[in-house]
């Protein structure tokens, strides 16, 4: 139960944590299990113990084996085992399965790929990221803290992602790489910041004085059933019900529609017998959910009657 698999590449740094943990004040002794030989704590050694951590700086294939750690407290001892395998560097691009960390999944929303084991190392930003051995370039990829963010994830983003960073130990630098698979799932549902499909921002709608006019506010909120999502109209920043103009009414209830699999809502604003003063008002289509509020503004302009005289 208290055994942990760890792996690394020759000539890279590898740091392994004891699978048994205790207070920072407890002493931890490390041994090479095959020979029962104690691992030194002096940092001048290539392989040395530092409390709960066993450091290979850098690692060599011959370091492979089982290491025993014993956490010692005044009242008890706890024993753990670290099964360490150091592999030769591959000449080709393929990362074999035995070097892969756990697979992570992403979706249509922003996805994060965390660099495995990085919290064990003394590293400084930025991380370098590679996909199938190619350095990642383009605005969709952002190296942030200990993870990679991919914007607008697509199925083509699936693949093996490698993070590369430098571990610093007493002024000496050691390279570390770690690889994990990333899969893209077709999600059952999600919510997103509202996207207004209509009207366009700052749209001018032509209307005829004395006639009726309809304005439709339409927005999408994600995939699947949406909770606390709404579209509505405001006049000069005021709710329709509070504005007090009976000629201008919102349709009762919101119509739900689906566009490209997205859940959308629309609300119609009906203006009866359009008057000159209606052209002076600001009409705001608001779409909101728990992610926030988006607003598109519409103004009305008089439609010029067709001139029949030439």
């Amino acid at each position: 139960k208290f055994s942990k698999q760890s792996w690394g590449l020759e000539n890279e740094a590898l740091i392994v944590r004891c699978p048994r943990q205790g207070k920072p004040s407890y002493t931890v002794d490390w041994y090479y299990s095959q020979t029962n030989k104690s691992i030194p704590t002096q940092e001048r050694n290539r392989v040395f113990a530092s409390g709960q951590l066993l450091k290979f700086l850098p690692a060599a294939v011959a370091d492979s084996g089982i290491y025993t750690c014993i956490v010692r407290s005044p009242t008890f001892n706890r024993t753990g085992y670290a099964n360490v395998t150091i592999y030769k560097k591959q000449s080709d691009c393929n990362v074999p399965d035995y070097l892969m960390y756990s697979t992570v999944s992403g979706s249509e929303k922003n996805s994060k790929i965390y660099c495995p084991t990085i919290d064990l190392y003394n590293w400084t930003a930025p991380l370098e990221w590679f996909k199938n051995c190619q350095a990642l370039q383009g605005s969709r990829y952002r190296a942030h803290k200990s993870f990679l963010v991919i914007d607008n994830v697509m199925t083509e983003d699936a693949g093996d992602y490698t993070c590369k960073f430098i571990h610093n130990e007493n002024g000496a630098n050691y390279s570390v790489t770690a690889t994990r698979s990333f899969t893209v799932k077709d999600e059952q549902g999600f919510s997103l910041f509202p996207v207004i499909g209509a009207p366009a921002q700052n749209e001018i709608k032509e209307v005829e004085i004395g006639k009726n006019a309809n304005l439709t506010c339409s927005a999408c909120f994600g995939k699947g059933t949406q909770f606390l999502a709404a579209v509505l109209w405001q006049l000069n920043g005021t709710k329709i019900t509070d504005f007090g103009e009976p000629r201008i009414q919102q349709e009762e209830g919101q119509n739900q529609s689906f566009s490209n699999g997205l859940a959308c809502l629309d609300m119609v604003l009906r203006i009866a017998d359009v008057k000159e003063e209606d052209l002076l008002l600001q009409y705001d289509c608001l779409a909101l959910n728990l992610h926030g509020l988006r607003r598109h503004t519409v103004r009305l302009s008089r439609k010029n009657p067709i001139d029949h005289h030439s």
Epitope: G106, K185, G189, S191, A230, L288, N289, L290
Partner: antibody, heavy 125, light 107 residues
């Protein structure tokens, strides 16, 4: 500082209704959504519904649809949760909480950042 | 709705221990995950949002990590005031759902 203060404990008979209030202070009430969560004795957290006060938009999770009504009074910066047709399994602590998204600068993250102290509702014959 | 599953449901630990709680989502939720702490008779308190960001005023011994479906809350050195129940919550799809909780007790 931001505070949500809820009304006191209630003892109710099965079949009756209860109305719990949640008074907000220390921030602009209309800029944030308020949600209601309940916790039965020794159980986890269950989301009931919520309201976006400035627009009066309320919504309820499927479990509570038809039995719960959430309202907000902008003038007193108070949100209300009314639960009807009470049964013994509705005995729980009811919490109001603020959603961290500010509607007027769309800033922040998505979480319940401030909570009321809770209101114990006991349903017993 | 998205199901959130926490493990373990309870654990016993000593002051100074490093404690790890995991949370798994029934579908990928990117990094839209929060962690809350609740003490008996009190309301929950937000600790971590967006999987790894520490809420203002929360001690740095609390940290969160993970993305996709698997997430972790770590308390690097358990303090007496940390004995409580911890809940994860997804904010990827409404309604935002909670895990069933993990109770951290004194050994």
């Amino acid at each position: 500082q931001v505070q949500l203060v809820q009304s006191g404990a209630e003892v109710k008979k099965p079949g009756s209704s209860v109305k719990v209030s949640c008074k907000a202070s220390g921030y602009t009430f209309t800029n944030y959504a308020i949600i209601w969560v309940r916790q039965a004795p020794g159980q986890g957290l269950e989301w009931m519904g919520g309201i976006i006060p400035v627009f009066g938009t309320a919504d309820y999770t499927q479990t509570f649809q038809g039995r719960v009504t959430i309202t907000a009074d902008e003038s007193t910066s108070t949100a209300y949760m009314e639960l009807s047709s009470l049964r013994s399994e509705d005995t729980a602590v009811y919490y109001c909480a603020r959603v961290s998204t500010n509607y007027y600068d769309s800033s922040g993250y998505y979480a319940f950042d401030y909570w009321g102290q809770g209101t114990l509702v006991t349903v017993s014959s | 709705d998205i199901q959130m599953t926490q493990s373990p449901s309870s654990l016993s630990a000593s002051v100074g221990d490093r404690v790890t709680i995991t949370c798994r989502a029934s579908q990928s939720i990117s990094s839209y995950l929060n962690w809350y702490q609740q003490k008996p008779g009190k309301a929950p308190k937000l600790l971590i949002y967006d999987a790894s960001s520490l809420q203002s005023g929360v001690p740095s011994r609390f940290s969160g990590s993970g993305s996709g479906t698997d997430f972790t809350l770590t308390i690097s050195s358990l303090q007496p005031e940390d004995f409580a129940t911890y809940y994860c919550q997804q904010t990827y799809h409404t309604p935002w759902t909670f895990g069933q909780g993990t109770k951290v007790e004194i050994k």
